[in-house]
């Protein structure tokens, strides 16, 4: 009979969900790398597809500074980024599938700490929820690594050398080569967070030029060779 069918249907009714957030206790990553901070949630609003805002903050729940915020229009999986601190944070999860997982690029030691995810339903079902315990991000130091070394043409038929290294703490760079005292001529500039670049502005002699990167965790070096052939300036690296 009809009531029997209806009872059978009701037996398959979705269990009433309540607000909850699932985050791991800790995420570990090395400086210079990227990390994913997982965060999934359940909510009591069945299949909500109204406007929503996803927020991540650091330090403490509810009051800590926001590092990321995005908003999705009704029915949309596209969460438009409104805030991404230093442009290094982006939503990896699908908020419509209750996933607020966040990717953090170019990690620095200073990024270590607790992060808290929050979701806000801003439509008819006006409601919000934030993780209380958060996920602890541990960024570990990284030994130096030289990522690029090159010789480039400079002014007045001269040549200059560039060396870019990464590490955390940021490594100190030094050039050495065939010209006496040329290491003191290296111009060192801070790059993006964990990357640094040093320039040797004028390569006056042929030979081997070595870039050394060092921090408290170790050192790395790489070399480039300059040979100017008779008849026309040129390099061999």
């Amino acid at each position: 009979d009809a009531s029997g069918d209806l009872l059978n249907t009701e037996a398959h009714s979705a269990p009433a969900q309540r607000w909850s957030m699932q985050v791991p206790a800790e995420v570990n990553a090395e400086a210079g790398d990227a990390a994913v901070l997982p965060c999934t949630f359940t909510h009591p609003h069945r299949h909500y597809d109204g406007p929503l805002t996803a927020i991540w903050r650091s330090g403490e729940p509810y009051a800590g500074p926001q590092v990321f915020r995005c908003t999705a229009a009704p029915g949309s999986e596209l969460c438009q980024t409104a805030l991404s601190l230093h442009g290094r944070f982006r939503l990896l999860g699908n908020p419509r599938r209750n996933d607020l997982s966040l990717r953090v690029e170019r990690l620095a030691l200073a990024d270590s700490g607790r992060y808290f995810c929050r979701v806000e339903f801003t439509g008819d079902a006006h409601d919000r929820y934030e993780s209380r315990h958060g996920v602890r991000l541990r960024v570990t130091a990284a030994a130096p690594r030289i990522v690029n070394i090159s010789v480039l043409p400079g002014p007045a038929h001269a040549f200059r050398a560039l060396c870019t290294a990464e590490g955390e703490p940021p490594p100190a760079l030094a050039w050495s080569g065939p010209a006496p005292g040329n290491s003191s001529a290296a111009l060192q500039g801070q790059g993006h967070g964990y990357q640094v670049t040093a320039e040797l502005p004028a390569l006056t002699r042929d030979g081997r030029y070595t870039c050394t990167a060092a921090n408290s965790l170790g050192r790395a070096e790489a070399s480039v060779y300059l040979f100017r052939f008779h008849g026309a300036p040129g390099t061999s690296t």
Epitope: A14, R46, H47, A73, G75, E77, L78, N94, R96
Partner: antibody, heavy 120, light 106 residues
Framework: EVQLQQSGAELVRPGASVKLSCTAS????????MHWVKERPEQGLEWIGR????????EYDPKFQGKATMTADTSSNTAYLQFSSLTSEDTAVYYC?????????????WGQGTLVTVSA | QIILTQSPAIMSASPGEKVTMTCSAS?????MHWYQQKPGTSPKRWIF???KLASGVPGRFIGSGSGTSYSLTISTMEAEDAATYYC?????????FGGGTKLEIK
């Protein structure tokens, strides 16, 4: 087991209306959106719209606004799609689809489809 | 509305061959979803959230892409993969499908 059982094929005259049904078993339709999708051989798949059977909230593709009417009856666990002022362009297979079990992807379960043929 | 353009419309591949089909969106999307349909049957969800395989989908299927450009790749074609594949977006109402890529076996 989750299933969507759609009503049988329809042969209708131009200008007439048709009402298709989709009865769900294995879950309660009020807990999930029900969608309707149109399939024509050369046009592929088109999303018509979705209904929230619990409160009747509806979202249509503007292309089908005024042409399609979605309703649902939670007591019989059935969703309906009514098409009006039929033309040859409405000749297609119509699927009802649910987002049940959306953790594993949208449009989890599809009905077997109902073929609607509009012909004089 | 976001228009999804799939290419090629029809393609054929030999068993063991690598197959790639693309889906281009007229506006940026966060994710792309893919469905497989064989003649006379209802579509099946195949790949969701751009790269996640639906339950039962073989690991030779790979979804990738971002923004406006997405692709579905089959690392080694098998006879059972012959079907029509549709991409689908939910980044803006109205939700839309691509026109489909029909993959045939040589």
């Amino acid at each position: 087991e989750v299933q969507l059982q759609q009503s049988g094929a329809e042969l209708v005259r131009p200008g007439a209306s048709v009402k298709l049904s989709c009865t769900a078993s294995g879950f309660n339709i009020k807990d999930y959106y029900m969608h309707w999708v149109k399939e024509r051989p050369e046009q592929g798949l088109e999303w018509i719209g979705r209904i929230d059977p619990e409160d009747g909230d509806i979202e249509y593709d503007p292309k089908f606004q005024g042409k399609a009417t979605m309703t649902a009856d939670t007591s019989s666990n059935t969703a309906y799609l009514q098409f009006s002022s039929l033309t040859s362009e409405d000749t297609a297979v119509y699927y009802c689809v649910t987002d049940y079990d959306y953790d594993g992807g949208w449009f989890a379960y599809w009905g077997q489809g109902t073929l609607v043929t509009v012909s004089a | 509305q976001i228009i999804l353009t799939q290419s090629p419309a029809i393609m054929s591949a030999s068993p063991g061959e690598k197959v790639t089909m693309t889906c281009s969106a007229s506006s940026s999307t966060s994710f792309m979803h893919w469905y497989q349909q064989k003649p006379g049957t209802s579509p099946k969800r195949w790949i969701f959230d751009t790269s996640k395989l639906a339950s039962g989908v073989p690991g030779r299927f790979i979804g990738s892409g971002s923004g406006t450009s997405y692709s579905l790749t089959i690392s080694t074609m098998e006879a059972e993969d012959a079907a029509t594949y549709y991409c689908h977006q939910r980044s803006a109402y109205p939700w839309t499908f691509g026109g489909g890529t029909k993959l045939e076996i040589k």
